[in-house]
């Protein structure tokens, strides 16, 4: 894992969109995809296990000194934990990649609490990229202005 | 060093109008989640106001939810509450709180002010 | 809304002893729960963040420890500096809330 982090806490729960879509992983030829679509009601939703660590701040980089902290994620289905969203900055998408060790850097995700129900994923290494929705897809996205709707994710605790 | 200082308390008449200020430094303030927090005399400790890191998002709880307004000048580095319609029962020391870390209400408050009274009397 | 309920109301130690403040949660949560301690006339300081994680400078005679509804604060060797009050805290869910508070003197 990251250099200086320390893992906080795990939780699972599900992961919907801004637009109430479901995120799930499905298995296709031996390997998981991530799906983003409308799932019914009464549909069982798929699960993510969230790792929370706390990273300090660098104060060249924060201008807080010591004080600044982040709160960072990593994410794995709760159906594999060994498996992580891994932000791909060469095609701008997210992936399910398989880990021997510890997540690499691509793996955690600063987050943002936007409003008290919706979070958004900021690439630790991409700063100003977020995960997205795109085409019914997870991708790398950035954001353009604070109000953007698809970065906005819902956690919800089963 | 991080500081949160408040000004504005002082004693009001029922009916009447306050703003609170928080002025903070030692730290980058339009990266916080910024809470006001009071506490009435000799009781605990309540939650009236949140506003996010951006500034976009406001909450608030049912018991001065239309009647308080949480706002922020980032270039000013101040935090404020505009309190209307008071009661004799918002009589308390309201603190300015900073959250724990970047962008997040998790973890807390681990900075409070020094707190301003804040009398509703007639 | 989550209610914080906190307990006891008031406690008396003696100068290392061991004290235990207890919280239950109305409905379980995540480990979003707080410590704070309030001396006389002052601000409240965070002891305690996410349940059970130290803030810094803060002395490790003080632990968290609980998690789902149930939270608790330990002092492991009361010291005269002690004496204060303490509350709970959750910011798991709108509205946030506190624990009513526990006084804590000394003997």
């Known amino acids: 894992s990251i250099q200086g982090t320390s893992l906080l806490t795990q939780s699972p729960a599900s992961l919907s969109t801004y637009n109430d879509q479901s995120v799930s992983f499905v298995l296709e030829n031996g390997c998981y995809v991530i799906n983003v679509d409308d799932s019914g009601k009464d549909q069982e939703q798929d699960q993510v296990l969230l790792r929370y660590y706390e990273s300090p701040c660098p104060a060249s980089q924060s201008g807080d000194g010591v004080d600044g902290k982040k709160l960072m994620v990593n994410m794995s289905p709760i159906k594999d934990t060994d498996i992580w969203l891994h932000a791909n900055d060469k095609d701008y998408s997210v992936e399910l990649q398989r880990g021997d060790v510890s997540p690499p850097e691509q793996a955690f995700f600063v987050l943002h609490k936007k409003s008290s129900d919706f979070v958004s994923f900021e690439c630790k290494n991409l700063p100003g990229t977020y995960i997205g929705v795109k085409d019914n897809q997870l991708a790398l996205v950035e954001e353009k202005d604070e109000s953007c709707n698809n970065i906005m994710f819902k956690l919800s605790k089963i | 060093e991080v500081q949160l200082v408040e000004s504005g308390g002082g004693l009001v008449q029922p009916g009447t109008s306050l703003k609170l200020s928080c002025l903070a430094s030692g730290f980058t303030f339009n990266n916080y989640w910024m809470t006001w927090i009071r506490q009435a005399p000799g009781k605990g400790l309540e939650w009236i106001a949140s506003?996010?890191?951006?500034?976009?998002?406001?909450y608030y709880p049912d018991s001065v939810k239309g009647r308080f307004t949480i706002s922020r000048d980032d270039a000013k580095s101040t935090l404020y509450l505009q309190m209307n319609s008071l009661r004799s029962e918002d009589t308390a020391t309201y603190y300015c709180?900073?959250?724990?870390?970047?962008?997040?209400?998790?973890?807390?408050?681990?900075?409070w002010g020094q707190g301003t009274l804040v009398t509703v009397s007639s | 809304d989550i209610q914080m309920t906190q307990s006891p109301a008031s406690l008396s130690a003696s100068l290392g002893e061991t004290v235990s403040i207890e919280c239950l949660a109305s409905e379980g949560f995540s480990n979003d729960l707080a410590w704070y301690q309030q001396k006389s006339g002052k601000s409240p300081q965070l002891l305690i963040y996410?349940?059970?994680r130290l803030q810094d400078g803060v002395p490790s005679r003080f632990s968290g420890s609980g998690s789902g509804t149930r939270f608790s604060l330990k002092i492991s060797g009361m010291q005269p500096e002690d004496e204060a009050d303490y509350f709970c805290?959750?910011?798991?869910?709108?509205?946030?809330?506190f624990g009513s508070g526990t006084k804590l003197e000394i003997k």
């Open positions: 996410a349940a059970s």
């Open positions: 805290q959750q910011g798991s869910k709108y509205p946030l809330t």
């Open positions: 506003i996010t890191y951006t500034g976009g998002g406001t």
């Open positions: 709180t900073r959250a724990n870390y970047y962008y997040n209400t998790y973890g807390g408050f681990p900075y």
